[in-house]
């Protein structure tokens, strides 16, 4: 007689990443009996919600339910019905909602209440929606990549199971770029973290970690572009802005009201003699780079050393995983290879930005023009941020690994967030039961 397969004893969890530009739903799965083991949780699905970020629904909250439907229904299909009631659902909102809250706490609360109402009506164990702090976003991103890279495992291996693994227990730093903020998180080498706000202490799997983290609000790629436009239009002689960060021949009309809508441009706000202006691309990497550098105030530092805007940054240490928009942008530009030096990246960016807009549109016919038009800026911004903002050099560039997925799971804060909220990262090293790592029973 045939042996009947035992039912899979697995658990699921759902995390929604409500970012500034869009929302993504992630479904995670793990063996129920191995909850405390490192590296057992993996992503089984990612569903990108169609539409903008939740902060854009502030004037149309009644549309939030429909907006979330497709991905929540997908979760219903992927997760077995018998597991629905036990599957936790978490929603974390990031910098887009931080900015909305700065403008109006009442409006931010209304959006979150309606998001919660929509998510509560699914048969999962919904645990609530909240705006996570920049510090949490950095910390959870760091936990995610190191968990997936096996850095918390005490078992030394003679073989490498994941890319980038140098087979030591040195953790990777985490570089996260979103639309509205960017995070840098790493363990400095024997360096005191001079500002308490940037210091985190963790005990994970029996080991202590002193971690540095900072989230730069308004320095995500979308908000950085708004900042740059607001800064540059101040000195424009008329309603034409000749912009080196866009391809030659590119034209776009921008409403001044849209430019000043975000708190990120408040410092550049002024009364302009026009309601609209036209961006005209001139495609010059060097000038674009120079314009971006003006967003970073490096003249003031109350610590031994700073990133920019007076924010403490210890000397960089070890390898770094650069993910989210760092990865998406560099992947589009074909610059994620470990073999591409920083000098080569700069050369490629110079060539790319100089390409005429019509040529670019033809070469990338399948890409939405809104996104396509911004890769020159985004690529240049990434280089400026990493080199001048965080002080990477041509030599240390090789320590940056542009990562999309590790072991099939997206690099980002969501997995770390779920691991923390489901208590799946123990402070102490779990005791191995005799059978827990055996090949067969």
């Amino acid at each position: 007689t045939q042996n009947k397969a035992l039912p899979e004893n697995v658990k699921y969890g759902i995390v929604l990443d409500a970012g500034s530009s869009h929302t993504s739903l992630y479904i995670y799965k793990w063996p129920a009996e191995k909850e405390n083991d490192t590296g057992v949780v993996h992503q089984v699905e990612e569903c990108r919600v169609k539409g903008p970020g939740i902060s854009k629904f502030v004037q149309k909250v009644n549309e939030i339910g429909i907006y979330l439907t497709d991905c929540m229904e997908r979760a219903r299909e992927v997760i077995p019905r018998s597991q629905h009631q036990e599957t936790p659902v978490y929603l974390g909102a990031t910098a887009g909602m931080r900015l909305l809250r700065m403008e109006s706490e009442e409006l931010a609360d209304r959006v979150l209440d309606v998001v919660e109402r929509s998510l509560s009506n699914y048969p999962f164990d919904f645990q609530g929606a909240r705006i996570i702090t920049g510090q949490e976003e950095g910390a959870y991103g760091w936990i995610t990549i190191n968990y997936l890279l096996g850095k918390f495992s005490q078992k030394t291996r003679w073989f490498s199971i994941v890319p980038y693994e140098t087979n030591n227990q040195e953790t990777f730093g985490a570089l996260d770029l979103g639309g509205a903020s960017t995070q840098v998180t790493f363990v400095p080498q024997n360096q005191t973290i001079e500002s308490p706000d940037n210091a985190l202490q963790f005990r994970l799997y029996g080991k202590d970690y002193n971690v540095y983290t900072h989230s730069f609000l308004c320095y995500g790629k979308d908000q950085a572009l708004w900042q740059k436009l607001a800064k540059d239009i101040q000195v424009a002689s008329n309603e034409i802005l000749r912009d080196p960060c866009f391809h030659p021949g590119y034209k776009k009309v921008v409403n001044v009201s849209d430019l000043y809508k975000t708190p990120c441009t408040k410092r550049f706000e002024m009364t302009l003699p026009f309601q609209q202006f036209e961006i005209q691309g001139i495609g010059n990497y060097q000038q674009c780079h120079q314009s971006i550098l003006e967003l970073f105030n490096t003249s003031y530092c109350p610590y031994s050393q700073c990133a920019f805007n007076g924010i403490f940054l210890p000397p960089l240490q070890g390898d770094f995983g650069a993910f989210s928009a760092f990865y998406f942008v560099m992947k589009f530009l074909n610059l994620t290879s470990e073999k591409v030096s920083q000098e080569k990246v700069t050369e490629m960016m110079k060539k790319f930005c100089a390409q005429p807009w019509e040529e670019i549109k033809t070469s990338y016919a399948g890409v939405k023009e809104k996104y396509l038009s911004e890769y020159c800026f985004s690529g240049t911004y990434i280089l400026s941020l990493l080199l001048q903002g965080y002080h990477f050099t041509a030599d240390s560039w090789e320590h940056i690994h542009f990562i999309g997925k590790i072991q099939g799971s997206d690099a980002g804060w969501t997995l770390g967030y779920m691991l923390n909220l489901t208590n799946m990262i123990p402070a102490e090293q779990p005791l191995s039961t005799p059978l827990s790592h055996s090949t067969y029973v």
Partner: antibody
């Protein structure tokens, strides 16, 4: 254990207003929403409105112009106020807890407060 | 507004029998339907949500089914304590609406 208890007048004159307080225990108003539902022999169960955990409200459009729901988290109380009452507002008024954080279905109901609108 | 119709005002059954209470929505509500039990002189008690998910503590003789516009609450092996009125409720869109109720009588 979870409990909700409505307290309010049993008789109100036509055109007057109604105020009911729902006092909750066993859960926090910062974690769950509270709905209001009424029941009458003529109209059955009617949903009136909800206050969600951060304080935003939604009302049944049929009652919106004369209804207000507020709360005091520290006192674990939700306040229901309806203006311009008429005879057909005679009903049992219930407060009910959202089953999940902010869901639109209810796992616990108060015992109800019976209201008669009459001169 | 979505109208929830419970066509049977009363249903008569015997202890040990199986009975099905039906509810029809005037438009598609997916599976956003809950069922409540109300005993005479008491407030409603939650039984089922999302059309077919039972609350913990609710006896497994209560089963919900259906999606779209047609929903059923089935009570198998009816007990005398099941004498009550049963209401369906849709929460697919505002305003939330309830069925007119079905009174279960024990023969």
């Amino acid at each position: 254990q979870v409990q909700l208890k409505e307290s309010g007048p049993s008789l109100v004159q036509p055109s007057q207003s109604l105020s009911i307080t729902c006092t909750v225990s066993g859960f926090s108003l910062t974690n769950y929403g509270v709905h209001w539902v009424r029941q009458s022999p003529g109209k059955g169960l009617e949903w009136l409105g909800v206050i969600l955990r951060r304080g935003s409200t939604d009302y049944n459009a049929a009652f919106m112009s004369r209804l207000s729901i507020t709360k005091d988290n520290s006192k674990s109380q939700v306040f229901f106020k309806m203006n311009s009452l008429q005879a057909d507002d005679t009903a049992i008024y219930y407060c009910a807890k959202t089953a999940v954080v902010a869901g639109d279905y209810f796992d616990y109901w108060g015992q109800g407060t019976t209201l008669t609108v009459s001169s | 507004d979505i109208v929830m119709t419970q066509s049977h005002k009363f249903m008569s059954t015997s202890v040990g029998d199986r009975v099905s209470v039906t509810c029809k929505a005037s438009q598609n509500v997916g599976t956003n339907v809950a069922w409540y039990q109300q005993k005479p002189g008491q407030s409603p008690k939650a039984l089922i949500y999302s059309a077919s998910y039972r609350y913990s503590g609710v006896p497994d003789r209560f089963t919900g089914s259906g999606s779209g516009t047609d929903f059923t609450l089935t009570i198998s092996n009816v007990q005398s304590e099941d004498l009550a009125e049963y209401f369906c409720q849709q929460y697919n869109s505002y305003p939330l609406t309830f069925g007119t109720g079905t009174k279960l009588e024990i023969k």
